[in-house]
Interface confidence: low
């Protein structure tokens, strides 16, 4: 009589996270008698995974009914999989007894766990910075195995090469993650623009994450002032208009200053948007030439997001 | 909350069109946005979602021909090389399958192609 | 592709009757559970039922229960109303992004 076989097909499966798994057995023989087990890893410290003859185990179900008499195949399938899931998987034919003696266990399947990667998140700087400045933004990916992965950075659909990346942790695990930091040069042109970080991994059959940061939320263009006096509209009316252009973003407060003292503070409000996403403002004041006996030293002083105020100046003759 | 198509009509074979779907009483910007069309007496076929982002996936005939767009209060379907059997009314729908399933609906805009 | 194969393609029944309609995908579907079921009445969009194989959607009446797991789906209406009279659609979601299909349809007809 030929004695039994455990024969397990596949040396090795892979699953996608979340999937359910299955994992072939079977045996040439019903005889001996006795029950077949599913054990992850080998040696004392293997991990119970089903036991056809007792045990509650709600993520297995058997592939066949294994109650059903000449029922030769135990192939189970392991529900929702998960990178924990991973290893090797043997099918092992016990002998009845007290208690039951394994007779003989298959050759073993190794399951490996693809995991996709989480949804990039690109995070940039707390605080805002101007054009010309470099500014950091990170790329966090986590819970994706295998270990290996690509991840690029982009702006506005360039590749960007000044980057560095690290995958943790350096030894074998059940899934990795993935950090990076890119070095980006901010030009005046960058409020439209976008930081992008692509993660290509196995799992996503050639389709990459990809997360984003909008320059918008970084960038602080200052504005340019230009004080100019308009042709008088009235007699002993003048009609001074500060320029404030190609700022961003839109916070900004103005004050009028007539030879050092406050003459009005208006916030930016009515602005026009430049097509490089920048705002222009404009602000007038009208000074009443006749209350003025000396010449009169118009300044116009522009707070913008916070910053230390910049201020442009124009003398107003005024004739004896 | 609601969402409306246009842009549909009649077009030559080999023609392109582009859909709008305008959405009201809500944001599309945390929304993928889902097509889905029905040829005329027959039944409903995904077409592709539009998800947050720069992410797209379309079923598997319409890639290449159908390319899907959004800002935060629009969506678009940009179809190209049009063929008669692609004659259908096209809905828009906010969502992108299993937890997130398509709970509104436009009210469909009519694309045919014939010469 | 995922198949979405639903049966059957069309019913007659009367108002208060029990009735069920079933889904079968060719493979699980995501999660084994990404199967939503949904209303459309001629001339309308279609509308939302039950989503996450048995989750009922929101403002849909409880006679609608939804129920399965893995390729195999079911929904039944309990007691069948008079605007309960329409084509119903499994939509079944396969692993990949790009795997969304509907069934073909069921037609509840007025015996």
């Known amino acids: 009589e030929e004695e039994l076989q455990v024969i397990q097909p596949d040396k090795s499966v892979s699953v996608a996270a979340g999937e359910s798994a299955i994992l072939h057995c079977t045996v040439t023989s019903l005889i001996p008698v006795g029950p077949i087990q599913w054990f992850r890893g080998a040696g004392p410290a293997r991990e119970l995974i089903y036991n056809q003859k007792e045990g509650h185990f709600p993520r297995v179900t058997t592939v066949s009914e294994s109650t059903k008499r000449e029922n030769m195949d135990f192939s189970i399938s392991i529900s929702n999989i998960t990178p924990a899931d991973a290893g090797t998987y043997y099918c092992v034919k016990f002998r009845k007894g007290s208690p039951d003696t394994e007779f003989k266990s298959g050759a073993g399947t190794e399951l490996s766990v693809r995991a996709k990667p989480s949804a990039p998140v690109v995070s940039g700087p707390a605080a805002r910075a101007t054009p010309q400045h470099t500014v950091s933004f990170t790329c966090e990916s986590h819970g994706f195995s295998p270990r290996d992965i690509t991840l690029k950075w982009f702006k506005n659909g360039n590749e960007l090469s000044d980057f560095q990346t690290n995958v943790d942790p350096v030894g074998e695990s059940v899934s990795y993650s993935i950090h990076s930091t890119a070095k980006v040069v901010l030009t005046r042109e960058d409020v439209h623009s976008q930081v992008i970080c692509e993660v290509a991994h196995v799992t996503l059959q050639g389709d990459p994450l990809r997360g984003t940061a909008n320059l918008s939320e970084t960038i602080r263009v200052p504005p340019t002032l230009e004080v100019t006096q308009q042709p008088v509209r009235a007699e002993n009316q003048v009609n001074v208009t500060c320029q404030v252009r190609k700022f961003y973003p839109q916070r900004l407060q103005l004050t009028w200053l007539e030879n050092g003292n406050v003459s009005r503070t208006e916030t930016a409000s009515t602005v026009t948007e430049n097509k490089d996403g920048t705002y222009n403002w404009m602000s007038w004041l009208l000074v009443n030439v006749s209350a003025h006996r000396d010449d009169v030293k118009l300044t116009c002083q522009v707070e913008h997001d916070g910053q230390p105020a910049v201020s442009k100046s124009h003398d107003l003759k005024v004739s004896a | 909350r609601q969402l409306v198509e246009s842009g549909g009509g009649l077009v030559q074979p080999g023609g392109s069109l582009r859909l709008s779907c305008a959405a009201s009483?809500?944001?599309?910007?945390?929304?993928?946005i889902s097509w889905v069309r029905q040829a005329p007496g027959k039944g409903l076929e995904w077409v592709g979602t539009i998800g947050t982002g720069v992410i797209t996936y379309y079923a598997s005939w319409a890639k290449g021909r159908f390319t899907g767009s959004k800002t935060s209060s629009t969506a678009y379907l940009q179809m190209t090389s049009l063929r008669s059997e692609d004659t259908a009314v096209y809905y828009c729908?906010?969502?992108?399958?299993?937890?997130?399933?398509?709970?509104?609906w436009g009210q469909g805009t009519l694309v045919t192609v014939s010469s | 592709d995922i198949v979405m194969t639903q049966s059957p393609s069309s019913l007659s029944a009367s108002v208060g009757d029990r009735v069920t309609i079933t889904c079968q995908a060719s493979?699980?579907?995501?999660?084994?559970?990404?199967l939503a079921w949904y209303q459309q009445k001629p001339g309308q969009a279609p509308k939302l039922l039950i989503y996450?194989?048995?989750t009922l959607a929101t403002g849909v009446p409880s006679r609608f229960s939804g129920s399965g797991s893995g390729t195999d789906f079911t929904l039944t209406i309990s007691s069948l109303q008079p605007e309960d009279f329409a084509t119903y659609y499994c939509l079944g979601g396969g692993d990949d992004e790009a795997d969304n299909t509907f069934g073909q349809g069921t037609k509840v007809e007025i015996k």
């Open positions: 996450l194989a048995s």
């Open positions: 729908a906010r969502g992108s399958a299993w937890n997130d399933p398509f709970d509104y």
């Open positions: 009483g809500f944001s599309l910007s945390s929304h993928g």
């Open positions: 493979q699980s579907v995501y999660g084994n559970n990404d």
